[in-house]
Amino acid sequence: MAERAALEELVKLQGERVRGLKQQKASAELIEEEVAKLLKLKAQLGPDESKQKFVLKTPKGTRDYSPRQMAVREKVFDVIIRCFKRHGAEVIDTPVFELKETLMGKYGEDSKLIYDLKDQGGELLSLRYDLTVPFARYLAMNKLTNIKRYHIAKVYRRDNPAMTRGRYREFYQCDFDIAGNFDPMIPDAECLKIMCEILSSLQIGDFLVKVNDRRILDGMFAICGVSDSKFRTICSSVDKLDKVSWEEVKNEMVGEKGLAPEVADRIGDYVQQHGGVSLVEQLLQDPKLSQNKQALEGLGDLKLLFEYLTLFGIDDKISFDLSLARGLDYYTGVIYEAVLLQTPAQAGEEPLGVGSVAAGGRYDGLVGMFDPKGRKVPCVGLSIGVERIFSIVEQRLEALEEKIRTTETQVLVASAQKKLLEERLKLVSELWDAGIKAELLYKKNPKLLNQLQYCEEAGIPLVAIIGEQELKDGVIKLRSVTSREEVDVRREDLVEEIKRRTGQPLCIC
C-alpha cells in the first residue's frame, strides 16, 4: 500500500515536471524523455481496483462546445456562409472517412498526421485530413469539370495541438473552391476577395494576406542549386520563416537537410524579400530568375493577379512574400495565407498568438491524381481557420464581458395568477404555430417574479402575461423585459405585435 502511495506521488511529481517543462518551452527531446518516464511510472501503477479512477474528459485535442460557444460559432459560420453564397457557391458534403489510398501521397511531410481507422471489414480507412482532397476525389469520381462549391465540416489531424491558441485534433474547416478551366487569375483573385471580405466582416482585427506562387518557389530553388528531390523538404523549412529567424531556418536546411551553405545563402537573398506589385516587377527583371520558365510564368500570373486585386479594392491587404511556402504537396500555382497583424487584445492583456487564420491556393494537378487517364481539372480555393477565429471572438467577448444570448426565444408565455397552465399551453401553441419563438416555464403555478427573472437571465425580450381579467377582456399583457413597460394587446393582434417588436418578417415565407 505504501509502495502504491509512493508511486502515485512520483506520478504526480512527474506530471508536474512535464507540465512545467512544456510551460518553459524546454527542448522537445527533454520533454519527450520526461513524458516517456511519466508513462513508465503510470504503467507500473497499473489499474487501482480499489478506486478505478477513470478521468472523465474529452480526448486530447478535442473539446465540447457550450451553448455560449455554439452561439459564437453560429454567428461566425453565418458570416462565412453568407459570403460564400454571395459569390454563387453551391454546397456539398463528403464522408468523414475516406479510403486510406485516397489520402495517401497528397500531403507530403504532413501525411504522418493522418488518423488511420482500425480495420473496418477489409477496407483501409482514414479520417479526412482536410476538405480539399475529398473534393478532388468527388470531382474525379463524378467526372465534374466545373463547379464552385463550399464545404463546412470537421477534419482530423494527429497533431500535438496548443489548444489555448485555437489548435485542435478535431476542428472545422470552411472551404470554398472553384474548379474549371478559366482565364488566368480571375478565380484566384475572387478567392482572395472572399478571404478579405470574411476577415473584415468578422472584425477580429487587422490582417494581411501573404501571397506567393509555387512556380516561383520551385524556379527560385532550381536557380539557387537545390536538387529536385529536396524541393519539398526545403519548402517546409522556408515556410517556418514567419516563426523563426533566417539563421535558424538556414541551420535546419544546412544541418538537417544537407543543403550546401552557399545554396542556402542564395535562397536567403530571395526568401527574405516581401512587398507588393513592385517586387513582382523587380523579380521579372532579375537576370537569373527571369530566365527560369516556371518562375517567369508565376511572376507573370502574380502581376496579373495584383491588377485584379486592385480592381477588387483589396491590394492594400496583400503582400507578395517569397518565404510563404505552404506545406501541402498539392499546390501548383498561387498560394496565400492570411495572418492577423495584431489580435484585438485589450490594454495590458497578452495578445492572442493564433497565427494563420485563412489560407489557400491553386492545385491544378490534384484531380488528375484520381482520374484513371490523369485528366486535370484546374482548381483554386481557400480555407478559413474557424477554430482560431472562434478562440479570438470568444476571448474578445470575455474581455468585453459581453452577454451572449444562447437562445433566440422572442417571448415567454407567463401567468400572473394560479391555475392558468391550460391557458399558457394554448397560447404558447398558438405562437409556435405562427412561427414565433416562444417558451413557458414547466411549472403549474410559477411565480411571476421567477418568470421575469428567467427572461432577464436568458435575454428574452418580451413576456406575454395571461391573467383572469385579461382572459375576460380578450387581451394579453405584453411586457418589455428591459423597459418594464406593459401594454394590453388584443389576442388576435399578439402575433403581429411580437413580430413587429422583434423585427421578424410578418409572414413565414
Epitope: E9, L10, L13, Q14, R17, E33, A36, L41, Q44
Partner: antibody, heavy 120, light 107 residues
C-alpha cells in the same frame, strides 16, 4: 539475487583509457534506467552519466562530456562506461546504480564500486 | 547546476537520541529529493525518496520532510548501526547533484 557487480577498474596514466562494466542480475535489466556515480577518495558523490532502458536517452556530467561514453547490452544484462582522455581528477570509486521505479533518478540498488586511479 | 548544501557537516549523538539533518537546494526542486546512508568502504544505501517516501526495508525511525528548497532527514531514536555519513541528492534536473555529506558520529 538482485545485485550489481562492477569490474574493469585499475591504474591508468593520464590521457589513457579504461572500460568499466557492470553486470546486473535478479531483475528485468532492460526496464531500468542505469547510471554511473563516482566518489573521489574521501570526497562526496558525483553523478557521471545515465542511460535509459531503451538506449534512447543518455546524458553526461559536464566534467566528463566528450570523454566518457555510456552504453548497455540488454541481452547480456550489462552496463558499460568507456573512459577516454583520463585525467587525475577522474580518480574515484565508480559505482553503477539502478534508478528507483525504473525511471526516477535516485539509486535504489548500487554495486560495490570499482576503483579507478589515474596517475603518472 | 543545482547546489545542495547540508548542515551540519558533522554531528555527535548518542544511541536513543533524535537527530535532524538539513539539506537546502539552491533553487526549488519540488519534492525531487533523496537521502542516502553510506558506511566506510560501502556503496550508499537509499533511505528516502520523493522527500518523504520510505524505501522498502528501511526502518520507520527514518523519516523525511520538506519541499521546494528546504528538506530534513530525521532519525527518531538513534541505533548503533545508524552511525554513518548521510547524503541528500536532488533528482529535479540533470546533472543530479549530492550534498557534501553529514557525518553522524558517536558522542
Amino acid at each position: 539475487q538482485v545485485q550489481l557487480v562492477e569490474s574493469g577498474g585499475g591504474l591508468v596514466k593520464p590521457g589513457g583509457s579504461l572500460r568499466l562494466s557492470c553486470a546486473a542480475s535478479g531483475f528485468t535489466f532492460s526496464d531500468y534506467y542505469m547510471t554511473w556515480i563516482r566518489q573521489a577518495p574521501g570526497k562526496g558523490l558525483e553523478w557521471v552519466s545515465y542511460i535509459s532502458g531503451s538506449f534512447r536517452y543518455t546524458n553526461y556530467a559536464p566534467s566528463v562530456k566528450g570523454r566518457f561514453t555510456i552504453s548497455r547490452d540488454n541481452a547480456k544484462n550489462s552496463l558499460y562506461l568507456q573512459m577516454n582522455s583520463l585525467r587525475d581528477e577522474d580518480t574515484a570509486v565508480y559505482f553503477c546504480a539502478r534508478y528507483v521505479y525504473q525511471v526516477v533518478a535516485i539509486g535504489d540498488l548500487w554495486g560495490q564500486g570499482t576503483l579507478v586511479t589515474v596517475s603518472s | 547546476d543545482i547546489q545542495m548544501t547540508q548542515s551540519p557537516s558533522s554531528v555527535s549523538a548518542s544511541v536513543g537520541d533524535r537527530v535532524t539533518i538539513t539539506c537546502r537546494a539552491s533553487q526549488g526542486i519540488s519534492s525531487w529529493l533523496a537521502w542516502y546512508q553510506q558506511k566506510p568502504g560501502r556503496a550508499p544505501k537509499l533511505l528516502i525518496f520523493a522527500a518523504s517516501s520510505l524505501q522498502s526495508g528501511v526502518p520507520s525511525r527514518f523519516s523525511g520532510s520538506g519541499s521546494g528548497t528546504h528538506f530534513t532527514l530525521t532519525i527518531s531514536s538513534l541505533q548503533p548501526e545508524d552511525f554513518a555519513t548521510y547524503y541528500c541528492q536532488q533528482a529535479e534536473s540533470f546533472p543530479y547533484t549530492f550534498g557534501q555529506g553529514t557525518k553522524l558520529e558517536i558522542k
